[in-house]
């Protein structure tokens, strides 16, 4: 259930896709990745207020219990719902290879 | 990549499965669920320090960027890696039905 997409905290404050520019050095990849030298990392950032983009029943339960026991149960968290594949050119023992990663760039976000 | 299962913050402080006892009233289910009247909700709670139970490449990137830009990029978050099914007996318009929910109880946790 992809519940409410309206953010009660104000525009851009709730769970959504953000892009963060990162160099190979930032990512700790400089020794083994040749290209790209800079990555536009898409990630899920933002708050998950009550029922906002609730991923499933578990997220709905978490919201209810967080309201009751905020010190024990954390609020749902903004995480990727799906990913975009990304190709990296990387150094190997035998030379250079093309590697596709299916779990690197967030495509869509939800709260869980 | 299910990275390190050793918690550097001390026993039980990192992302792991917790059980929280909740009544139907707590969950807001009292009007439509007949049984069980109390649910042992298993959920993922705890910190996600560097590379602890990193779910995938995205989680590893998030850790690196959080270290560099803690005000912009949040740390990875402890969420279910898989679920246990749960059967609820629920009230319907025509009577009572048995319903299995596949996304209600966390079975295993990771950081993402």
């Amino acid at each position: 259930a992809r519940n409410g997409d309206h953010c009660p905290l104000g525009p851009g404050r709730c769970c959504r896709l953000h892009t963060v520019r990162a160099s190979l050095e930032d990512l700790g990849w400089a020794d083994w990745v040749l290209s790209p030298r800079e990555v536009q990392v898409t990630m899920c950032i933002g708050a998950c207020p009550s029922q906002f983009r609730a991923a499933n029943m578990h997220a709905q339960i978490k919201t209810s219990l967080h309201r009751l026991k905020p010190d024990t149960v954390p609020a749902p968290c903004c995480v990727p719902a799906s990913y975009n594949p990304m190709v990296l050119i990387q150094k190997t023992d035998t030379g250079v290879s093309l590697q596709t990663y299916d779990d690197l760039l967030a495509k869509d976000c939800h709260c869980i | 990549a299910r990275n390190g299962d050793h918690c550097p913050l001390g026993p039980g402080r990192c992302c792991r499965l917790h059980t929280v006892r909740a009544s139907l009233e707590d969950l807001g289910w009292a009007d439509w669920v007949l049984s069980p009247r109390e649910v042992q909700v298993t959920m993922c709670i705890g910190a996600c320090p560097s590379q602890f139970r990193a779910a995938n490449m995205h989680a590893q990137i998030k850790t690196s960027l959080h270290r560099l830009k803690p005000d912009t990029v949040p740390a990875p978050c402890c969420v279910p890696a898989s679920y246990n099914p749960m059967v609820l007996i629920q009230k319907t318009d025509t009577g009572v039905s048995l319903q299995t929910y596949d996304d209600l109880l966390a079975k295993d946790c990771h950081c993402i």
């Epitope: 040749l34 290209s35 594949p85 190709v87 990296l88 093309l98 690197l104 | -």
Partner: antibody
Framework: QVTLKESGPGILQPSQTLSLTCSFS??????????VSWIRQPSGKGLEWLAH???????RYKSSLKSRLTISKDTSRNQVFLKITSVDTADTATYYC?????????????WGQGTTLTVSS | DIVLTQSPASLAVSLGQRATISCRAS??????????MHWFQQKPGQAPKLLIK???NLESGVPARFSGSGSGTDFTLNIHPVEGEDTATYYC?????????FGGGTKLEIK
């Protein structure tokens, strides 16, 4: 199996607009790091890179030709297009499209067989 | 723009001998770890074919008689031993930045 194939008008008169299509298969332009470039080669001469369209629709052009070039893509149909306005005899060449993998600093691993353009009055 | 200067413009090498082609860049195209220079072979009437990527890495399916070396601004393509089917024009190309540029080409003839 990756393939690319260029198509174009073959012959144009000076001042007309050239429209080229690159149809490809075996990869997707929705994959981060994938892109397609257009490169041309006048008969008996060297290779000249013209333009590039990336997976995220980032478009890059050779600066000296930028005002005349427009690159675009249709991701769902696996096609990349190039338009060159106000063609002249100097634009007579074989036009290639090539896949560039792995981001900006990647390499051209697959090329089409080329389409020949003659500009003549 | 980075200018790539190839030398010689043409060369004739006897069958079984070594062919050496140079490519000089107008600025460095290397980091401390990797070099962003590639080599292509083009036969008459055909599209260019990738031989070497990142200065020294042989593309899959390319015979081991082709090798590349160099860093910074100076790069070399070696073919040894040369075979009859190696008659072609060879181009270097950088991917250091946009615009990508190619060398002027070296025409190899087998004697």
């Amino acid at each position: 199996q990756v393939t690319l194939k260029e198509s174009g008008p073959g012959i144009l008169q000076p001042s007309q607009t050239l429209s080229l299509t690159c149809s490809f298969s075996g990869f997707s332009l929705s994959t981060s790091g994938m892109g397609v470039s257009w490169i041309r080669q006048p008969s008996g001469k060297g290779l000249e890179w013209l333009a590039h369209n990336d997976w995220d629709d980032d478009k890059r052009y050779k600066s000296s030709l930028k005002s005349r070039l427009t690159i675009s893509k249709d991701t769902s149909r696996n096609q990349v297009f190039l338009k060159i306005t106000s063609v002249d005899t100097a634009d007579t060449a074989t036009y290639y499209c090539a896949r560039r993998v792995g981001g900006l600093e990647g390499y051209f691993d697959y090329w089409g067989q080329g389409t020949t353009l003659t500009v003549s009055s | 723009d980075i200018v790539l200067t190839q030398s010689p413009a043409s060369l004739a090498v006897s069958l079984g001998q070594r062919a050496t082609i140079s490519c000089r860049a107008s600025q460095s195209v290397s980091t401390s770890r990797f070099s962003y220079m590639h080599w292509f072979q083009q036969k008459p009437g055909q599209a260019p074919k990738l031989l070497i990527k990142y200065a020294s890495n042989l593309e899959s399916g390319v015979p081991a008689r082709f090798s590349g070396s160099g860093s910074g601004t100076d790069f070399t393509l070696n073919i040894h031993p040369v075979e009859g089917e190696d008659t072609a024009t060879y181009y270097c190309q950088h991917s250091w930045e946009i615009p990508y540029t190619f060398g002027g080409g070296t025409k190899l003839e087998i004697k």
